[in-house]
Every structure is written in C-alpha cells, then in structure tokens.
Interface confidence: low
C-alpha cells in the first residue's frame, strides 16, 4: 500500500511540478502535508534556478549531481539521497516524511551512524570479553595478548608461553622458572644471575661489609664470626658482635693474707731463703685449705741440695718425704684434710724427730738420727719453696708426686720468723691472692683452656672408639666452649658448647662437628646456683644425649655424614681441650669463646683432674670454684 502511495505521489509530482511549474499550494496538494511541502519547496526553487536554460551551465556541470531538472526534482523528497548516513557505519537508510532513519552496522551508533561504539568499555561485557588486551577499532574491536602470551582459537583468551620448555637453554646453568608472560633465571640463595655468562655467580657478601668483626665468604653464603677469646659473641642478627655477659655473678673477692698455691700451673709460687744461726731448726706453721687431694705444700732444702724435706698432700692426707746424709724417709698420716676447711698444720724439727701436728694434735712423729739440715760456717742456710720444687728434685723423690696443688695457706710462720717480708711480696701480686670463699669443683675463668691426652680407642668394642662424657656444670656466662676434640690439622671434629638462647635467661647446648651444629638442646636454665648435669655418648654410629629434661638419640639425614667426619678424625689423633679452644681459625667451630664457670668432667668413666692436664691456663682452678655472689642488704 505504501509503495502504491509513493508511486501516486511521484506521478503527481511529475505532472504538477516538472512538466509544469508549480507554486507552493500546488506542491501542498501533491504531498498533502506541511512538513514535506515545507521541506520540498525551497529545494524545488533551487532546482529551477539551476536548470533554467543557459544559466549556471559551468556550475551545473561541476557541482550539480543531477543531469536534468527531472532528476533534481525527483530526488528532493528522498531523504536518503544524497546519503545522510556515515558510509562506514550505516547498514541502510530509510526515507521518512522530511526525515530519514540510518540503520547502523554492529559497532556503530548515532543518528547518522557516525559514532563508533567502544566495545572495550561496555559495562555489560567487561573488556569486550577479552582476557587481556581489548583493542577498539572503528565499528569493531579485537582482543590481543600481552608479550609472552598467545591467543587461543576463541580469539578472546590468552595462554602463557612456557619459554623454559620452548628454549631449554635460555638460562644457561641457572634454573629457568616460567612466570605468567615471562620467565626468570633463578639462582640459589647467595648467588646472583649473570646475564652475559648465563650462569649463577656467588655473591661475595664479605666485600659488602656485612660483619662487624670477621667474615668468611663461601659459595652461596657467608658467616660472621666474633672473637670469642676476647669475650665477644655473635649477636642475634648474626652480623654484629656483643660482649659475652655474665649470667651468674661469682664472689671473686680475694685477700692478700691468703696465699694462693696454684698461681702457676708449672712452677713455684714463692721462694724464700733463710740464713739463721746454726742452732736453728726447721719449723713451719700455717693454716691450709684445699679440696685437692694431691700436691706439694712446701719443699725445703739445704743450700747445697744435699738435704731436703717435702711437705705434701696425698690422698687428702699429709705426707712428709725427707732425705739427708743420715736417712731417707716417707710418711703419710693423720686425717683427710682436703675438706675445704681451714686446717692448722705445723711441722717442727725436734732434737730426734720431726713432729707433724694438725689442729695442734700430733699426727706423725718421724725419727731422725741428726739435724735435718747441716749448718755451715755457724749459719743454717735453708731454701723454702711453696707449692712446688726445683725441676731436678723430681727424680730424687722417694715417691713421685704431682706437685700441683690448688689450695691456700694463711697465718704462716716459717723458721719461727713470722710472716715478715712475705706479706709485702704477696700484697703487690694480685694473682697470688686466694679467694675468700670457695666450693668443691673446677673453675674456668673464661680466659684459658686445659689440654688432655685421652685415648678414645676401645679395642674390645666393635665401634673402635667411643666418647662417653658426663659434665656437671654451673656456668657464669651463657656462651663458651666446654669441651672440644681438636685434630692435628686445626679442625675441631667434635665440640660441646654453650650459647645464650634466643629465649630470655636461658641457654642452649650445641653439639658440633667441625663448624656444623649437629644438635641443639634449646632453652635450658643453666645459669643458676645449682649444678646442671649433661651426658652424651658418641661413637661412629650413634650420638646419644641426656639432660635432666630430655633424652635424645640424635638422628637426622646429615648425622651419618658428620659422624663419618668425626670417625676419620678419631682414627687419627685428637687432643682434648676443656674450657675453650686452642689457636684454631674462628670458622673452625660455631662457638669460640672460652667457657666461664664451674665444670667437672668425666670422660669414659674417668673423672678428669686438671692437675693431670698436659697444659692448663694458670687462671683455671683445678679443685676450687668461687661461690655464687650473694646480694647483701648493703650492696
């Protein structure tokens, strides 16, 4: 029906306005409505002007799209001619009454389809449905992928490219790790990737001044060390150093009136020479205190060494050995006096005997045919040595003795001359002063070590060697090496050390093979006035450990490898050190500070006597331990 109407209208237009000229009223009759008429008539007049004979010929040829008046007039009512829609964006144009409708292609909008729709910003279809990049284009869009991804067949989703699989050698000797859109060349901790060489290179952390004192770089890492022998330990940050602090203060008060007999590990503490009238006889009186069971209290001899007298302790009892031109004697007697109490001892030469008294009670009377020391030129010249004797005497003794004696004497009176002159000598020398109060035990002051030679080989055992150790300890600082076995090549195949724990006011015990901690007993309260007990047993197959709170048979993957290292060292020769380490590199063990505190050690069933050590630092007390410092109301 519409098309019939259009055809009718077209016919009327031809007749009324092309074959003849029409005015506006006549045009109104053709269109039968004002909007179309108002739209048509001005344009009709333009057509007439254009096609009047002879007028604007040049212009018509160049600018007018219509060849004649008919075409020009017929085109006026068609709103879609010339095309008002955007050519790129329209799909069709529909003519209306003095209007037109552009139908847009997908992706375009606007009255004339002149505006591109940005599908990438469509809230109902986020990012155009693309998984990564949405590219808007005129009238359309497309999805694309970031570097390192490829588009899937659905043209929307992206898939990661696994560069590590595509090019296995992409990272060289480093490990290739695929990551979304890329890859990384990974190195172990402590290594850095070198792009040029395509390999992992060790980071030298020591060149970056990571450590406060000593730094040892190794492939993949570094370790900081502090000089334990100077009283430093590694701080919790594992980089800086801090002072090894006292956790249990001890009463280290000394008195110069008390002479310490163990000032020297080897050697005499005091040497005196007497020149007295020939009627003088030997006499010595003193108070004596010790927990030691054997050692020399004093040795006296004539000026020509022909006669001598030894006052010593053996098995805790007084022993006298004497030798002169008339006789050679050895006598032991009296009660045990190594009880830590002050005992009054007197040795007096009488006319026919030597009398030994303890607490003024005679315990021995030794007969002698003549004077002990022979006077010469009207004088009795005598040399007296405290806590030792000249080296050559050792071979002359009637019965050998270990001269070392950890004890104290006070109130001495030699040759009836009182203490004159001696006190003045002692007063000046702090290390000759004795502690006011001591307890049973051995004391390591944190400044030195003792060395023993112990044969750990057990022929009867299938293991070949074993180390069974019992430690009774009362540490005064929370860090230090208690026991170490040291090889000839300056390595430490086994050590037992103390370190301050990360948890407050407690300590850990470390067992180490060389510089590796093979076991750590954590958070023990060892800094107390009570002794703590620790046992461990080690052979080439096992490591067992016992504390009052924990029993462990230690087993982890690495242990057998570490025990193999220890086994190798034990088959060679090891020296046993108590209280610290000899001069080995800082890096030889996890701890290198000296142990400070009391400690008694039993190895393979034998209680170690520090007097029997091959060497011992003078400050280590073999048989006495300072008491715990008690706060008094005044202090």
């Amino acid at each position: 029906a519409n098309s019939l109407l259009e055809e009718t209208k077209q016919g009327n237009l031809e007749r009324e306005c092309i074959e003849e000229l029409c005015n506006k009223e006549e045009a109104r009759e053709v269109f039968e409505n004002d909007p179309e008429t108002d739209y048509f008539y001005p344009k009709y007049l333009v057509c007439l002007r254009s096609f009047q004979t002879g007028l604007f010929t040049a212009a018509r040829q160049s600018t007018n799209a219509y060849p004649d008046l008919r075409s020009c007039v017929n085109a006026i009512p068609d709103q879609c001619s010339p095309l008002p829609c955007n050519e790129d964006g329209y799909m069709s144009c529909k003519d209306g009454k003095a209007s037109f409708t552009c139908t847009c292609k997908p992706g375009w909008q606007g009255e004339k389809c002149e505006f591109d729709i940005n599908e990438c910003k469509d809230p109902s279809n986020i990012n155009g449905g693309c998984s990564q990049i949405c590219d808007n284009t005129p009238g359309s869009y497309h999805c694309s992928c970031k570097n390192g991804f490829v588009m899937l067949s659905n043209k929307k989703d992206c898939k990661d490219v696994d560069e590590c699989s595509l090019k296995p050698s992409i990272c060289g000797t480093a490990v290739c790790k695929n990551i979304p859109g890329d890859f990384e060349c990974e190195c172990p901790e402590g290594y850095r990737y070198n792009l040029k060489s395509k390999s992992c290179e060790d980071i030298d952390e020591c060149s970056e001044n990571m450590c406060a004192q000593l730094c040892v770089n190794y492939p993949g890492g570094y370790t900081c060390y502090c000089d334990g022998k100077k009283g430093f330990k590694l701080a919790q940050d594992q980089k800086s150093c801090e002072v090894v602090s006292v956790c249990l203060p001890l009463n280290l008060d000394t008195k110069y009136e008390l002479l310490y007999l163990a000032e020297q590990f080897a050697g005499v503490v005091l040497y005196l020479k007497f020149r007295l009238p020939e009627i003088s006889r030997f006499s010595a009186e003193f108070d004596f205190r010790t927990y030691d069971s054997e050692g020399v209290i004093l040795y006296a001899e004539s000026i020509d060494h022909s006669a001598w007298l030894l006052i010593a302790l053996r098995g805790g009892k007084i022993e006298v050995q004497l030798k002169n031109e008339h006789t050679s004697k050895i006598t032991t007697g009296g009660d045990v006096i190594n009880n830590g109490l002050w005992n009054m001892v007197s040795v007096e030469e009488l006319e026919h005997s030597i009398s030994i008294k303890i607490a003024k009670e005679a315990v021995m009377d030794i007969n002698k045919p003549g004077p002990l020391f022979k006077p010469e030129n009207g004088l009795l010249e005598t040399k007296v040595y405290f806590a030792g004797f000249p080296r050559k005497v050792e071979s002359e003794l009637i019965k050998p003795i270990n001269p070392r004696l950890d004890g104290c004497i006070r109130s001495w009176n030699l040759m009836k001359q009182g203490a004159s002159g001696i006190k003045e000598i002692i007063q000046e020398k702090q290390n000759k002063h004795c502690l006011v109060t001591v307890e049973k035990g051995s004391y390591y002051p944190g400044s030195g070590i003792a060395q023993f030679h112990i044969d750990y080989n057990n022929v009867s055992s299938a293991e070949g060697w074993h180390v069974n150790v019992t430690l009774n300890i009362r540490p005064s600082t929370g860090t230090g090496v208690m026991l170490a076995l040291v090889s000839g090549n300056n390595t430490v195949p086994f050590a037992v050390s103390l370190v301050d724990s990360t948890s407050e006011k407690s300590q850990d015990i470390l067992l180490s093979v060389e510089n590796t901690v093979i076991y750590r007993i954590q958070a023990l309260s060892l800094c107390s006035d009570q002794q703590s007990h620790l046992e461990f047993r080690v052979n080439r197959n096992n490591l067992e450990l016992s504390t009052p709170l924990k029993i462990e048979t230690i087993s982890h993957e690495d242990l057998q490898r570490q025990l193999a290292v220890l086994d190798k060292a034990m088959k060679a020769k090891v020296a046993t050190y108590l209280g610290g380490l000899p001069d080995v590199p800082f890096s030889a063990t996890p701890v290198n500070a000296f142990y400070n505190g009391c400690m008694e050690v039993n190895i393979n069933g034998v209680q170690l006597d520090l007097d029997e050590a091959i060497s011992k630092h003078n400050d280590i007390r073999a048989h006495s331990c300072p008491s715990v410092w008690k706060k008094t109301k005044n202090s």
Epitope: N472, E544, E552, I554, S555
Partner: antibody
C-alpha cells in the same frame, strides 16, 4: 629379675602428706643407667607421671610441673629403696600410685610396682 | 607439655582379627621416643613396645609398633582372647613424660 615392692598407707587426710616407699630387688637404686619414678592413675587424670630420681655421679630429681611445688622423691641407698612424699594433698590426689623403673637413660617404664590405692578423705 | 591423643576410644573386634590403634602427639616426640603399654584390670601397665617399634622382652610377635614424629600405630596382627583390654601410649622424649588417654579393645 627386677621387682618393685610398694608400701605405704592407703588413706590420707586432706592437707596432710602422702608418703610411699618402693623397695627394689634385682637392681640398684644407684644404677647409673636407670631412673626411678612415681606414676599415678585416676579416672579423671588417666596415667600421670609425677617425677623421678636418678644417679649420675650425683643424685638428680626431675618432677612434673603440676606437682613440682609439693613433691619430694628421695633415694634411700642404704635400703635400696626410693620414696615419694606429696605434701598438702586434696581429694584430687586420690589415685592408684605406681613406682616404676625408667630403663637405661630413657623414661619408658619396663618394671612397675603392684600399685597402691591412696584415698584422700577426711 | 606434649599431649597424646589415642584413637579410637573403644575398638570392637573379634578374636583372630587385626587391630590397629593410633596415637597422635601434639608435637614431635623426637627420634621415636614412644612406648606402648597394655593394662589389664587391677594390674599395673605392662610395657609392650619402646622406641616406637622395639618389642619388649617376652612380648609376642603379633604385637608391632610403627611411626615417628607425631603419628604412631600399635598393630595386633591376630587378636587372642587375652588381648582384649586397655592400651596406652607414652612419650619419653621430653619432660614431663605423658601418656595417652587409652584405647579399650573389646570383643565384638
């Protein structure tokens, strides 16, 4: 063959002290490789280790935190025994009390006493 | 302290069957420091297994133990009538030494 024989009263008044003794035969209380323990059992608490004593060149004690402030375990070397003293008892302490040997260094219990039912009641 | 949890609380089986008892620790008990005990009414506990898997002297080989760290199992391969009683696990790796609450094995 190790045997442990327990003795002691079966009834104790609240706030008083519970005392039990364990006599050892076939082993020594001073054995360097053993620990001598007390364990109790009650329906509410089940089996509960109380503590032990052991000799390693000197005597040591080891107590459970729950009773530490009021327990004493002592060796009696002259009689080859060890004893338990639990002070300030309450009805909560009513249980069967066992003495037991901890083998070697380890605190698993290979020999047990016959058990003593101790009732805390006024 | 280390808490030991035994499961199941009660296990009902017939003679000749296989029993599997479980013991779980709240933290690692070290190198297999776990023991199993059997307790019959009116008697003291009797040691069956120590070190998680080592049978005590005189214990029949139908009893076996396994596990390490935090998970342990006692297995009785063929139940005999005398096996129907209560079983306890105990850790001795660290003080205080603790026991499980027990598993009762009863005849179905």
């Amino acid at each position: 063959q190790v045997q442990l024989q327990q003795s002691g009263p079966g009834l104790v008044k609240p706030s008083q002290t519970l005392s039990l003794t364990c006599a050892i035969s076939g082993d020594s209380v001073s054995n360097n490789n053993a620990a001598w323990n007390w364990i109790r059992q009650s329906p509410s608490r089940g089996l509960e280790w109380l503590g032990g004593t052991y000799y390693r060149s000197k005597w040591y004690n080891d107590y459970a935190v729950s009773v530490k402030s009021r327990i004493i375990i002592n060796p009696v070397t002259s009689k080859n025994q060890f004893s338990l003293q639990l002070n300030s008892v309450t009805p909560e302490d009513t249980a069967v009390y066992y003495c037991a040997r901890g083998s070697s260094w380890y605190r698993f219990f290979d020999y047990w006493g016959q058990g003593t039912l101790v009732t805390v009641s006024s | 302290e280390i808490v030991l949890t035994q499961s199941p609380g009660t296990l009902s089986l017939s003679p000749g069957e296989r029993a599997t008892l479980s013991c779980r620790a709240s933290q690692s008990v070290g190198s297999s420091y776990l023991a199993w005990y059997q307790q019959k009414p009116g008697q003291a506990p009797r040691l069956l297994i120590s070190g998680a898997s080592g049978r005590a002297t005189g214990i029949p080989d139908r009893f076996s133990g396994s596990g390490s760290g935090t998970d342990f199992t006692l297995t009785i391969s063929r139940l005999e009538p005398e096996d129907f009683t209560v079983y306890y696990c105990q850790q001795y790796g660290s003080s205080p030494y603790t026991f499980g609450q027990g598993t009762k094995l009863e005849i179905k």
